[in-house]
Amino acid sequence: AVNGTSQFTCFYNSRANISCVWSQDGALQDTSCQVHAWPDRRRWNQTCELLPVSQASWACNLILGAPDSQKLTTVDIVTLRVLCREGVRWRVMAIQDFKPFENLRLMAPISLQVVHVETHRCNISWEISQASHYFERHLEFEARTLSPGHTWEEAPLLTLKQKQEWICLETLTPDTQYEFQVRVKPLQGEFTTWSPWSQPLAFRTKPAALGKDT
């Protein structure tokens, strides 16, 4: 038997993916474990094999269908179980009644691009990926800009409290290399969390014109 504290956390990407992480102190790395999804009002069941991501945690993705298909709604409840093999039998290690739209984590924004860049400002746009049409405009964003000599953790967060898939960065330094990231979060859901940060977009401001003040 496996002893120790266990944590089983899952998030729904709002379309066709439930990502799960199971942590168990003292669990065996070579044990075969599955996450089993049993919806209360759907005809399908789904499993995914947990793969080790660290000494005491495992992860997998329940892929429910094509990436942009709407597989669950706000009224669905999915019973999620972690089952691990013990000899010829399977033991339930963790269980939760999962409400997908209370546990949202969207995919990171994609397709970041510089729309327009000047000496002191830069206009950047992006797109959201695999986000449910249920949200309509009820999304918010956080953005951050990496300046030379700083870390991402030091970058101030810019908050966009509406579904605005662009930003105009101001007060930038001419002829300077920057990087930019953005993340998204639905307003819905008690346990909803921010998406991962987007891939960083590198850009450079234009040099100041010669003979002019900057």
């Epitope: 075969s32 599955q34 089993h36 069941n45 499993t47 995914c48 094999e49 793969l51 892929i63 990436p67």
Partner: nanobody, 123 residues
Amino acid sequence: QVQLVESGGGLVQAGGSLRLSCTVSGDVFVRYTMAWFRQAPGKEREFVALVTDSGRTTEYVDSVKGRFTVSRDNAKNTVYLQMNNLKPEDTAVYYCAANTDYFRIRSLDANTWGQGTQVTVSS
């Protein structure tokens, strides 16, 4: 709806090898635990091997362990059964099967079956 198409069967002498392939279309391949079953003339269909969605875990019926290897290529939407040291008792129609639920596929409960490919092992 998901479709499965097997290939690679044929006639082979005892001790020989064959590689069966099963290509999946119509759905997201990595959703599925994939399995091979076989049915010999006058016998019931039996489980041969399976591979989980990630490809990390494989399982076999005792009679083929050490001779057969199941694998999958998620980029090619294909599952394989490499059969070595074939024996006359391996003669059967081999079926590929898919289920999104790992716990159901072992009990012949598949979402979808292929049409089967004949493997004949002569002595």
